[in-house]
């Protein structure tokens, strides 16, 4: 059957149908819905919200909705022996304790099981000594305290502030650095936008504010104890000593009155220059320890915080595919929040919500898919994307078969300025094409296209005309499906403007204050934001799973094939002396992007003209297209990541959040001048390159012709 | 065979201009990324500046809002605008494909 034998309506009427059917208001009440109480994973609430989901997606029409559970390791404060920092003097004595809570924001304060700032999956510990301010705590930063400044943070407890890099990482670079202890806060510089009053009045960061959040290095292991399989009934666990990416030293996050305690008393160095200094008034000295007065003062931690194997439950909806049942386009975000979710996650499920009342309306009206849709309500993504990877591990035969796309749906927005999207360059025109068909939802752009504003607010930085797509690095639920297993992956939300608002994130992610108010009075009160990132993700979702031929256009993956050459080309060559001594080459990989690019470009011609009547050719060709993200997985992994898979993308070694292009090559010239065995060093990057290019060859050739 | 030949060296006075080319043969110029590099006397190799295949341009600190590569894929030829000159500008250099693959270079005195 054709699809439009198989769906009884004309594709145009059905996309329209189906985006006209998304309402602004049902996104609202969806949100209000999902933001009263708290949805930790592992609780009650939240197993309660998984069957209320299940039971409202079965009744918008999905053909199944069921809940798959895991037993994976969580992490809890301890109820009764609360976590905090203090400073003691020379006698012992706790002079100054940090909060044991967020004060509750207005309308909340009879909430209970409001989960107390935490980093998830801190050991247990008490250390005490002499404070080491470290400013973000990225690998720069240290390189700057040790290399430049010969300050040795062996056996101090540091002090970071959040923001610019995944909190992982810096818990990671203190250890590596012989921190006993981390001590993270959110700095105003970062956190606290000028002109902006904090929660309840406006969308600030209050002083007693705290962002939660795990510290793991799980490097897309997901459940801790279950490396590579799912933490099933009959699952082995590994013991505690040989989980995978648990920090080993005491980390606790404060929020900045807190953090104005402990800095403004801090001595030794001065700040190296001032990018170190945040907004608080202190001197941002670096330590270590405490200024002449009080230098026989320390700072003490006490954590109690117990890690847990606790049941987690997704929730999967299935609409099934009319004529290709065995193709799996998939909408997934998570269901899990830290408290309220008022941005994380509920605006991206609410949004996720609304999509599947919108399909299962259309569903009701006897029209399906041409391939199967799955909506996914993952858990425990905030312990570190735990619901998602689990599934992922128990599903993957069919999903490395099967799969021809994840859309993400974490938080809809991060701000109300524009859109921003990260994906792979299979879907650069998908994302394009669809967003000049939408609406654009920005003042001073009306009747203009969603393309339009977003390529005016965000241009490309390469093609003028253009708006700016990101890589996608990790930190969300895509992280298994896009890494690990190779499907095409994207993700698509409202974001800030960068130029002119500096801070991390946005402020109040991951406190108590991310509330259903704070999104309905201060982010988007006409929810015509959310409204549009529904579209664009439903549209990607529907265009994915209903085009004859896969909206994938492999031509642009040669374009930026070309680019990330180019670029880890230009980061070798820093090196003219060792790439001359050990005679590296790139010829190689510039002719792996060569024969790709001309490849690409033949099957693109043949795309156009072959007949798509004939159900196997077309099949045939959706295959190659379905196939080709899948091409540059390499089996055995990345170096010591052996779950990040994919050649040309990982998230960055130095930052989860950020994607990394050629991180194999990049990770062996990283740093390579200290390197104390050079020959081997450059072994490495030599051995990297030729895994770069036999994996872009090797993707080139499942393009050709077939025989 | 690869080859690579510079041209375009010489001596001249600080604060004025040269254009450094080279013209390479032996492989597809236009699909293969190229630098500059250079030594200066006394010293290690220094990179001085990267062209991509797909164009986009990469500069050492030293010569940034200085220096300008450029290339004609046309003509096999990839160029250096040196402006700006500085006595420590004065080096041999070096046309290079990577590691393995260096043209003889020419050589650039910046002097009064």
């Known amino acids: 059957k054709s699809s439009n034998e198989a769906t009884n309506i004309t594709p145009k009427h059905n996309m329209k149908a189906f985006l006209d059917e998304l309402k602004a208001e049902n996104i609202k009440k969806f949100l209000y819905n999902f933001t009263q109480i708290p949805h930790l994973a592992g609780t009650e609430q939240n197993f309660q919200l998984a069957k209320q989901i299940q039971s409202q997606w079965k009744e918008f029409g999905l053909d199944s909705v069921e809940l798959a559970h895991y037993d994976v390791l969580l992490s809890y404060p301890n109820k009764t022996h609360p976590n905090y920092i203090s400073i003691i003097n020379e006698d012992g004595n706790e002079i100054f304790n940090t909060s044991l809570f967020e004060p509750p924001p207005p309308g909340y304060e009879n909430v209970s099981d409001i989960v107390p700032p935490f980093s998830a999956f801190s050991p247990q510990g008490m250390p005490e000594g002499d404070l080491v301010y470290v400013n973000y705590a990225r690998t720069e930063d240290f390189f700057k305290l040790e290399r430049d400044m010969k300050i040795n943070c062996s056996g101090k407890i540091v002090i970071a502030r959040y923001g610019k890099v995944f909190r992982g990482n810096k818990v990671k670079n203190a250890q590596l650095a012989g921190a006993k202890g981390v001590i993270l806060y959110s700095d105003p510089a970062d956190y606290f936008a000028p002109g902006v009053k904090s929660y309840p009045d406006g969308w600030n960061l209050p002083g007693g504010g705290v962002q939660r959040g795990n510290i793991l290095n799980l490097n897309g292991a997901g459940d801790p104890l279950t490396p590579g399989y799912p933490a099933n009934e009959y699952a082995y666990r590994r013991g505690i000593a040989e989980a995978v990416g648990l920090p080993s030293i005491p980390v606790h996050p404060i929020g900045y009155y807190d953090a104005q305690k402990l800095l403004e008393k801090m001595g030794g160095s001065a700040p190296p220059d001032s990018s170190w200094r945040g907004s608080l008034k202190v001197p941002y000295n670096v330590g270590p320890g405490f200024t002449g007065n009080f230098s026989t003062q320390k700072v003490k931690m006490h954590i109690h915080s117990t890690n847990e194997v606790t049941r987690i439950y997704n929730v999967i909806g299935t609409l099934r595919g009319a004529v290709e049942p065995d193709r799996y386009v998939i909408l997934g975000g998570h269901r899990d929040s830290w408290v309220f979710g008022g941005i994380d996650p509920q605006s991206g499920a609410a949004v996720v919500h609304e999509i599947v009342r919108s399909f299962g309306t259309l569903k009701k009206e006897g029209w399906r898919p041409r391939r199967t849709i799955l909506f996914a309500s993952w858990d425990a993504e905030e312990f570190g994307l735990l619901g998602s990877t689990e599934w992922a591990e128990e599903n993957s035969r069919l999903l490395q078969e099967r799969g021809v796309a994840y859309i993400n749906a974490d938080s809809s927005i991060e701000g109300n300025y524009t859109l921003r999207v990260d994906c792979t360059p299979l879907m650069y025109s998908l994302v394009h094409n669809l967003t000049k068909e939408l609406k654009s939802p920005d003042e001073g752009f009306e009747g203009k296209s969603l393309y339009e504003s977003w390529t005016k607010k965000s241009p490309s930085p390469e093609f003028s005309g253009m708006p700016r797509i990101s890589k996608l690095g990790s930190g969300n639920d895509f992280e298994v499906f896009f890494q690990r297993l190779g499907i095409a992956s994207g993700r698509a939300r409202y974001t800030k403007n960068w130029e002119t608002n500096k801070f991390s994130g946005y402020p109040l992610y991951h406190s108590v204050y991310e509330t259903y108010e704070l999104v309905e009075k201060f982010y988007d009160p006409m929810f015509k934001y959310h409204l549009t990132v529904a579209q664009v993700r439903g549209g990607m979702v529907f265009e994915l799973a209903n085009s004859i031929v896969l909206p994938f256009d492999c031509r642009d993956y040669a374009v930026v094939l070309r680019k990330y050459a180019d670029k880890i080309y230009s980061i070798s060559m820093k090196h003219p002396q060792e790439m001359k001594t050990y005679s590296v080459s790139f010829d190689s990989l510039f002719s792996a992007v060569k024969n790709f690019t001309e490849i690409a470009s033949k099957f693109s011609e043949r795309l156009q003209d072959f007949d798509k009547s004939n159900p196997i050719v077309l099949r045939m060709m959706n295959d190659q297209l379905m196939f080709l993200e899948r091409a540059f997985i390499d089996p055995l992994g990345l170096p010591d990541r052996p779950f990040y898979r994919h050649v040309i993308y990982a998230p960055s070694s130095h930052n989860k959040y950020a994607g990394e292009s050629f991180p194999g090559i990049y990770d062996a010239l990283f740093d390579i001048e200290s390197k104390v065995d050079p020959s081997k060093a450059w072994g490495e990057v030599k051995r990297q390159i030729y895994v770069a290019a036999f994996t872009v060859q090797a993707a080139a050739e499942t393009l050709s012709e077939v025989a | 065979e690869v080859q690579l030949v510079e041209s375009g060296g010489g001596l001249v006075q600080p604060g004025g201009s040269l254009r450094l080319s080279c013209t390479v043969s032996g492989f597809t110029f236009s699909s293969y990324a190229v630098s500059w590099v250079r030594q200066a006397p006394g010293q290690g190799l220094e990179w001085v500046s990267s062209i991509g295949a797909g164009g986009g341009t990469y500069y050492a600190d030293s010569v940034k809002g200085r220096f300008t590569i450029s290339r004609d894929n046309s003509k096999n030829t990839l160029y250096l605008q040196m402006n700006s000159l500085r006595a420590e500008d004065t080096a041999v250099y070096y046309c290079?494909?990577?590691?393995?693959?260096w043209g003889q270079g020419t050589l650039v005195t910046v002097s009064s």
């Open positions: 290079a494909k990577d590691g393995a693959d």
